[in-house]
Amino acid sequence: AGVFELQIHSFGPGPGPGAPRSPCSARLPCRLFFRVCLKPGLSEEAAESPCALGAALSARGPVYTEQPGAPAPDLPLPDGLLQVPFRDAWPGTFSFIIETWREELGDQIGGPAWSLLARVAGRRRLAAGGPWARDIQRAGAWELRFSYRARCEPPAVGTACTRLCRPRSAPSRCGPGLRPCAPLEDECEAPLVCRAGCSPEHGFCEQPGECRCLEGWTGPLCTVPVSTSSCLSPRGPSSATTGCLVPGPGPCDGNPCANGGSCSETPRSFECTCPRGFYGLRCEVSGVTCADGPCFNGGLCVGGADPDSAYICHCPPGFQGSNCEKRVDRCSLQPCRNGGLCLDLGHALRCRCRAGFAGPRCEHDLDDCAGRACANGGTCVEGGGAHRCSCALGFGGRDCRERADPCAARPCAHGGRCYAHFSGLVCACAPGYMGARCEFPVHPDGASALPAAPPGLRPGDPQRYL
């Protein structure tokens, strides 16, 4: 036994565009309350009932009146926890539905009017005794933030609240075969007293006085093997006293699960995993139909016209889950090729392509130079999804349309003066230097560090750089 506890942190508009209108107004003040419904197992249904693990209703929140013109803020919440007691073991996996209800406090005839504002559903794994788990769920434009936990009620302990604890009889340690009840180290695990004579090897009990048999054993005390004939394909353990077990009729033979449920054998007997919309030991009970509106975010409910048939939600693009309750991060699949940037716009997926690529998914590699003329005799060079022009002497810029200033980089060394020329640049060297860029000193004795100047050029003459 134990208690499932739910703490609502906030309920208000979710992120993104399309903020919802405030549910309350000056003309129609209202207050919120919450309902939680729990069911065992990872059933894929979002039924309003039955809530096999239990259900709870919160207190009413403070009265809220919208401020005219203000966006809907996080709405005032009821105080305290929602608590759902469970009598048996905690199942470890559970389905939940949390509904946000509005109570209108206007002058309604016959008392306040209630309407469902939002409903979120999900399936979770949770060990009893663990810390609070935090969650955020969205329903349309609303966002609900909450925490939950399951805790055992003494004397039960453990992740399923199935172990029982008793105060220690001896001060120092627990009895033989019994463990301390962490975190209650001063208590000891209490043995369950099964039915007298229940086989310790082949029987067990979850409640005092019962005797349940492991697979392959039967009888009131679980001492009779299902079959002791030959030893073909044993189903269970063998022993010298009982011989080998052969497949007797297994608990799943003939599939006891109705409505398309799948059967799995358990130590006790069998367990049915039910399709969405069904529950019960043999999936014989239908919980939710299309009339309950189980599909969120524009999902279409298919089937489930009556309580005997399951429903399926066909989800619009961008949503998934048995109730279309989960938003798909479509960009996580990296649909944009060649380094394109993925944008999930909600109504569509867009790829913003890098230069040189095109197409809905940037799948087309453009010919970078196609239709790209480089001016003034420049030549186009492809590379990395972008074109580049290799410009003729005296021209520059992306398309070689700009006349280059050859002197901009100060190419003349040692204080030489630079002159732009139709075919490039000319350096007028300072006294004592020579060369196309005035890079070579002239020796004081008249000889230079270079071979003799070409005929017709004296050291110190402007050297034209061709």
Partner: antibody
């Protein structure tokens, strides 16, 4: 701007199969549901069925045994086949795109009249 | 299936007047999953309203939708000559998708 264009024979003989194709231009057929709707002369609109780009289908129950909707994403087309037609199947047939906000129709083809007659 | 009944079958009004078209569902339409379309002779229907009250892109604000549960209304606040057409409602809460029989809005 998404555009849809129906194509196929305008005259079909009773008991034969009506075949229509819808070509989608101005957008990808992927990531959407696509539907067929018909309108008998002088009457209202009747939903026939839809297909998702993944191939998932859903049909109007009374037509289910006779309808097949298929999709060819490489050609940006989806098709309708309606078998064993009778005069009651004479109608203007529309193809349409289902919106992302829910299962309503935001883009329609201009429609094509199919007459069932011998 | 959800049966949608539109009324009146024909509505005769003059330009400038207010038009109120009704769509009633045989079962409650969850989450207001209801759309309205306009169809002119020889043309395909055009989406006007979805979610019972949200206007589709490019639809003038003289068109408005309201209602919930089983009763929905399309209102045209001030009729323009181009508004005279047939109007259909459609539910998309559950399969099969169904349309109303239509309301013909004609010039008086």
């Amino acid at each position: 701007q998404v555009q849809l264009q129906e194509s196929g024979p305008g005259l079909v003989k009773p008991s034969e199969t009506l075949s229509l194709t819808c070509t989608v231009s101005g957008g990808s057929i992927s990531s959407y549901y696509w539907s067929w709707i018909r309108q008998p002369p002088g009457k209202g609109l009747e939903w026939i069925g839809y297909i998702y780009y993944s191939g998932r289908t859903n049909y109007y129950p009374s037509l289910k045994s006779r309808v097949t909707i298929s999709i060819d994403t490489s050609k940006n087309q989806f098709s309708l086949k309606l078998s064993s037609v009778t005069a009651a199947d004479t109608a203007v047939y529309y193809c349409a795109r289902i919106a992302v906000a829910g299962f309503f129709f935001d883009y329609w083809g201009q429609g094509t009249l199919v007459t069932v007659s011998s | 299936e959800i049966v949608l009944t539109q009324s009146p079958g024909t509505l005769s009004l003059s330009p400038g007047e207010r038009a109120t078209l009704s769509c009633r569902a045989s079962q409650s339409v969850n989450k207001n999953y209801l759309a309205w379309y306009q169809q002119k002779p020889g043309q395909a229907p055009r989406l006007l309203i979805y979610g019972a009250s949200s206007r589709a892109t490019g639809i003038p604000d003289r068109f408005s939708g309201s209602g919930s549960g089983t009763d929905f209304t399309l209102t045209i606040s001030r009729l323009e000559p181009e508004d005279f057409a047939v109007y259909y409602c459609q539910q998309y809460d559950r399969s099969p998708l169904t349309f109303g029989g239509g309301t013909k809005l004609e010039i008086k």
